[in-house]
């Protein structure tokens, strides 16, 4: 007799989702043997690198890559040695590079290169850093949400595969520069460029998806700031008891906030702002990010942009789920529904910032941005996308799913590394003995 | 020119309550500002106390929360200090000082920074009998 | 309450030396991307004086010989050549949660 190796029992990927604010880095794990099963990858643990995003090294590309080491490091502790050369590595950027390559295409080329250059000395099988589409970003969100959940395919007890008869959920992701909408349609799409055509399972699905640039949390805020320095003298959305500085040119330098800027400015100018808490000038603020005077389609959301109605279920994740988590949580109030929601947002507006701390204590200067984060949610959802009561009864605000963290960064590797086969595995399962 | 000075009794008896008062030169303490104290045990790091903002709002450190009161006269532009029942152990130098939020820039993202950039010379306060 | 630890308690240099500070939080510090810490400088009978702020960023005035870096829990405050003025006491400060904390100091005396 002979000893015969039995094939490892798991493989790993990995994927570093460099976001507006910062990165995370993912290890995903799946059973070798059921890699076409749906579910069945998970998240084997994650890491923040710590300090901002990549796009804020545009100054100092080589710090990009330097702070990726820490996490990177974790990466060859969490992944045994064994796999690390069989492990595929993947960095997707998001719209805070989509934002730098808008305003310094070389600087962009100069971070991605940088961490490329840092990814590389790992013993993982590196595939690639590149700046993912806006599209890109919601159709992956899309289908992490629906492989956790188990919406594309199911087991049956007799070793057969078999469609669900659920629907898919539309995933709904609030970023830091961006947010996208993705879901299920049944009709074709007006604007071809919001249509993704999709075989998974040997099942087709038509997927409406849009990403707004400057929507993301991060820059809505920035947006309201420079719209608060231009029509008040104080901020609205900020509460009362709340003052800052602002030196001009930290206002005005994104890209989202061109509109807002002045034809002449100071930029090195401090302004000193104070917060109002007042609900009602900070709805009109908020509502004045979204246009809805032209819309060349049957049907829009916002700015022109077409949109069929939304259907089905929905998963809200990211800075969605941490803003009405701090509703839920933090603050003790009920947002079940539409109503309900915006009577939270109102609430949180009108608490002084004195109210804000001691209703949460140990917090700092985030607690500030709750109010205008709350009432952004809220209008983006009711008028924005177009949720009336009966259909935001079908939205759920959850961050993970099968203890996986929701997002793009599942369903890029999914994709990349042909987890999800477009055809259903053609025999049932059993077990090789060759 | 901004400019802070605190003023009070430099001994103090255990049990009593300890009183400085600040007083600010050169900007309104109604201004946009929060008024903070600061204290410095001998030979030991700083603890911030509590502070009174433009806006009137207190913010104490819970670790003294039910000893400490800031208040303020505005037409003095002058805000103070008064800690309670005292003991040896709130022997220290005091330091009154303006802080803000200062606005910063981030990877796309903004945020607030609490900075306290103007300060006064220090009073030292000896708790004794 | 969030706890800084800074070392060492006390550094001797030389005039042209590197100074290098260390400052350890119990827990991150870090929001979103953003460092919420601040370094002070004190002299002997003086008010303390802001130096750093955000982690990195230089308060106007304050010479280029300083910098600051580092994030989640760990920070450090380099002096790249010390001068004669720079001998002083400096201190770290979080303003991440609150209370605010400062760090226990650590004296930059001469060699």
């Known amino acids: 007799t002979r000893d015969i190796r039995e094939p490892p029992a798991l493989k790993y990927g990995i994927v570093l989702d460099a976001g507006s604010s910062h990165t995370s880095m993912f290890i995903y794990k799946w059973p070798a043997d059921k890699e076409n099963d749906t579910g069945i990858v998970g998240q084997h643990s994650s890491c923040d690198v710590p300090g901002g995003g990549i796009s804020s090294y545009a100054d100092n590309p080589s710090g990009a890559g330097q702070s990726l080491v820490g996490c990177l490091e974790q990466a060859l502790r969490d992944v045994p040695k064994e796999r690390h050369a069989g492990t595929p590595l993947y960095l997707g950027a998001t719209a805070g590079m989509r934002l730098l390559n808008l305003t310094n295409p070389e600087a962009s080329t100069s971070v991605l290169t940088a961490v490329t250059h840092t990814l590389t000395q790992y013993p993982f099988d590196f595939r690639g850093a590149r700046i993912l589409s806006g599209q890109e970003e919601g159709v992956f969100g899309w289908v992490t949400a629906n492989y956790l959940l188990e919406n594309f395919i199911k087991y049956g007890w007799v070793g057969r595969w078999f469609r669900p008869r659920k629907g898919t959920l539309g995933a709904m992701d609030l970023g830091g520069a961006s947010t996208q909408i993705t879901f299920e349609t049944t009709s074709p799409a007006e604007d071809r460029a919001s249509e993704v055509q999709l075989r998974l399972y040997g099942q087709h699905y038509r997927v409406y998806t849009h990403s707004f640039l400057c929507y993301g949390r991060d820059q809505v805020l920035q947006r309201l700031l420079a719209s608060a320095l231009q029509t008040h003298s104080f901020h609205p959305c900020w509460p009362r008891g709340f003052s800052t500085h602002v030196l001009l040119g930290d206002v005005y330098q994104s890209p989202c906030t061109v509109a807002q800027r002045p034809q002449t400015f100071n930029s090195s100018a401090r302004v000193s702002l104070s917060g109002s808490s007042d609900p009602h000038l900070c709805r009109d603020l908020v509502s004045g990010l979204f246009s809805f005077s032209s819309c060349p389609f049957s049907r829009c959301s916002f700015n022109g942009v077409f949109q069929p109605p939304v259907a089905g279920n929905f998963i809200a994740f990211s800075a969605f789920f941490y803003t009405v988590n701090f509703l839920r949580t933090s603050m003790g109030l009920p947002v079940a529904t539409l109503q309900q929601l915006e009577a939270a947002a109102v609430n949180v507006c009108n608490q002084t910032w004195a109210q804000l701390q001691a209703r949460v204590p140990g917090q700092q200067a985030h607690l500030a941005d709750y109010c205008a984060g709350a009432m952004f949610v809220q209008q983006l959802l009711s008028r924005g996308y177009g949720f009336d009561e009966r259909a935001f009864g079908g939205v759920i605000f959850q961050k993970k799913a099968a203890d996986t963290a929701v997002g793009w960064a599942l369903g890029y590797m999914l994709n990349l590394t042909n987890l999800i086969p477009a055809d259903p595995p053609g025999l049932r399962k059993g077990t090789d003995f060759s | 020119q901004v400019q802070l000075q605190e003023s009070g009794p430099g001994l103090v008896k255990p049990s009593q309550t300890l009183s400085l008062t600040c007083t600010v030169s050169g900007y309104s303490i109604t201004s946009g500002y929060y008024w903070n104290w600061i204290r410095q045990h001998p030979g030991k790091g700083l603890e911030w106390m509590g502070y009174?903002?433009?806006?009137?709002?207190?913010n104490y450190n819970p670790s003294l929360k039910n000893r400490i009161t800031i208040s303020r006269d505005t037409s003095k532009n002058q805000f103070s200090l008064k800690l309670s029942s005292v003991t040896a152990a709130d022997t220290a130098v005091y330091y009154c000082?303006?802080?803000?939020?200062?606005?910063?820039?981030?990877?796309?993202?903004?945020?607030?920074?609490?900075?306290?950039?103007?300060w006064g010379q220090g009073t030292t306060v000896t708790v004794s009998s | 309450d969030t706890q800084m630890t800074q070392s060492p308690s006390s550094l001797s240099v030389s005039v042209g030396d590197r100074a290098t500070i260390t400052c350890k939080a119990s827990q991150s510090v870090d929001y979103e991307g953003h460092s919420y810490m601040n370094w002070y400088q004190q002299k002997p009978g003086k008010a303390p004086k802001l130096l750093i702020y955000?982690?990195?960023n230089l308060e106007s005035g304050v010479p280029s010989r300083f910098s600051g870096s580092g994030s989640g829990t760990d920070f450090t405050l380099t002096i790249s050549s010390v001068q004669p003025e720079d001998f002083a006491t400096y201190y770290c400060q979080q303003s991440n949660e609150d209370p605010p904390t400062f760090g226990g100091g650590t004296k930059l005396e001469i060699k």
């Open positions: 009174i903002s433009y806006d009137a709002d207190n």
């Open positions: 000082a303006g802080g803000y939020y200062r606005y910063g820039l981030g990877s796309y993202s903004g945020s607030y920074y609490y900075v306290m950039d103007y």
């Open positions: 955000a982690a990195s």
